[in-house]
């Protein structure tokens, strides 16, 4: 079941999530001067069966001067810094260390994909909350939200999570000593 | 809470202009395209077009292409469809849809009448 | 553009029986199908996405299933409240299409 809305926003901080559930949409969502091709899903999806789970649909890039019933109106001010390189081998990483029945792991890029990713998550999903470059986290409990269904109505747990600023970055998803490396894996995962 | 809130209703003269807006809370606006819906007793539902707000990207259905013409403020969390040259046929009840058509506005009913 | 047929306009059912809603998409679609309910004076509300997966708050007894050509939408234990008009959607090709919806009548 579809989560209603998007987690929760903490100030200087990004989420991530190590794996998503079954029945989870990615947007196919492209750079500037791209959009998605006129054929196929508007989002790919995590589907499979209890012991295997992949992306379906893939997501296409087409130039957007090639289609004469697309336009592109007064473009809007970039709002999102380019994914760093770094920040991928990171989720990467992320994803190459669990294989959970029932999840999909972060999908490759595609071609000409936008720079920040979004995704439609469904109910029980975590997602693991850092801090930005030249912010430390204070906790007061776990770094992550979940989506939860409650008097059948979804929402998300907030993060008990504080971006202070700082110069050093703080460890994903989160503990108490900040590391320049934010490859860490909650103990919890596993398990979930 | 998603919600898209549209007026609920328009009264307008044939030949003129109508411009309607949805009004969007409760997620990143920017992020998801907004689609356009038409309803007409007999006719069902018809996809007019959408708009991306963030990417400013916007797709019509051939058939709509002249009558609608679709904006998006960041600023306000707003779209707009603005149908021109109004006739008998435009009387319909108009929906935008957003989240990869989860969330639907109340429509708003448009009427065209001399 | 890719047609929608829901053959069967209006379907009557009783309370606590099973109904199958039917669309058929005039070419592949894979499974880039969404069904929807709208009940009198209401706008429509999203039931299934991906031809199979609920939105929340959808009861269980809404089941989803098809891919390709053929759809199905089937309400199991049908309640009073399931009374309304239901509509599949392709969205595999621009320009997305509708089915011409389905009328479910209680008797």
């Known amino acids: 079941e579809l989560c209603d809305d998007d987690p929760p926003k903490i100030t200087h901080a990004t989420f991530k999530a190590v794996a998503y559930k079954e029945g989870t949409m990615l947007n196919c969502e492209c750079k500037r001067g791209f959009r998605r091709i006129k054929s196929g899903s508007p989002y790919m999806l995590c589907t499979g069966n209890s012991s295997h789970s992949s992306w379906d649909n893939q997501c296409q890039c087409t130039s957007s001067a090639a289609r004469n019933t697309t336009k592109q109106v007064t473009p809007q001010p970039e709002e999102q810094k380019e994914r760093k390189t770094t920040e991928m081998q990171s989720q990467m990483q992320l994803a190459d260390q669990v294989s959970l029945p029932g999840h999909c792991r972060e999908p490759p890029p595609w071609e000409n994909e936008a720079t920040e990713r979004i995704y439609h998550f469904v109910v029980g999903q975590t997602v693991y909350y850092q801090c930005v470059q030249g912010y430390r986290a204070l906790h007061r409990g776990p770094a992550e939200s979940v989506c939860k269904m409650t008097h059948g109505k979804t929402r998300w747990t907030q993060p008990q999570l504080i971006c202070t600023g700082e110069t050093e970055p703080s460890q994903f998803p989160g503990e108490e000593e900040p590391q320049a490396s934010p490859d860490g894996l909650p103990e919890s995962e596993t398990s979930r | 809470q998603v919600q898209l809130q549209q007026p609920g209703a328009e009264l307008v003269r044939p030949g003129t202009s109508v411009k309607m807006s949805c009004k969007a809370a409760?997620?990143?606006?920017?992020?998801?395209?907004i689609g356009w819906v038409k309803q007409r007793p007999g006719h069902g539902l018809e996809w007019i077009g959408d708009?991306?707000?963030?990417?400013?990207?916007?797709n019509y259905n051939e058939k709509f292409t002249g009558k609608a013409t679709l904006t998006a403020d960041t600023s306000s969390s707003t779209a707009y469809m603005q149908l021109s040259s109004l006739t008998s046929e435009d009387s319909a009840i108009y929906y935008c849809?957003?989240?990869?058509?989860?969330?639907w506005g109340q429509g708003t009913l448009v009427t065209v009448s001399a | 553009d890719i047609q929608m047929t829901q053959s069967q306009k209006f379907m009557s059912t009783s309370v606590g029986d099973r109904v199958s809603v039917t669309c058929k998409a005039s070419q592949n679609v894979g499974t880039n199908v969404a069904w929807y309910q709208q009940k009198p004076g209401q706008s429509p509300k999203a039931l299934i996405y991906s031809a199979s997966y609920r939105y929340s708050g959808v009861p269980d007894r809404f089941t989803g299933s098809g891919s390709g050509t053929d759809f199905t939408l089937t309400i199991s234990n049908v309640q009073s409240e399931d009374l309304a008009e239901y509509f599949c959607?392709?969205?595999?090709?621009?320009?997305?299409?509708f089915g011409g919806g389905t009328k479910l009548e209680i008797k």
């Open positions: 708009i991306h707000p963030g990417g400013g990207y916007i």
């Open positions: 409760g997620y990143t606006f920017s992020n998801y395209w």
């Open positions: 959607q392709q969205y595999n090709s621009y320009p997305w299409t």
């Open positions: 849809v957003s989240r990869n058509f989860a969330n």
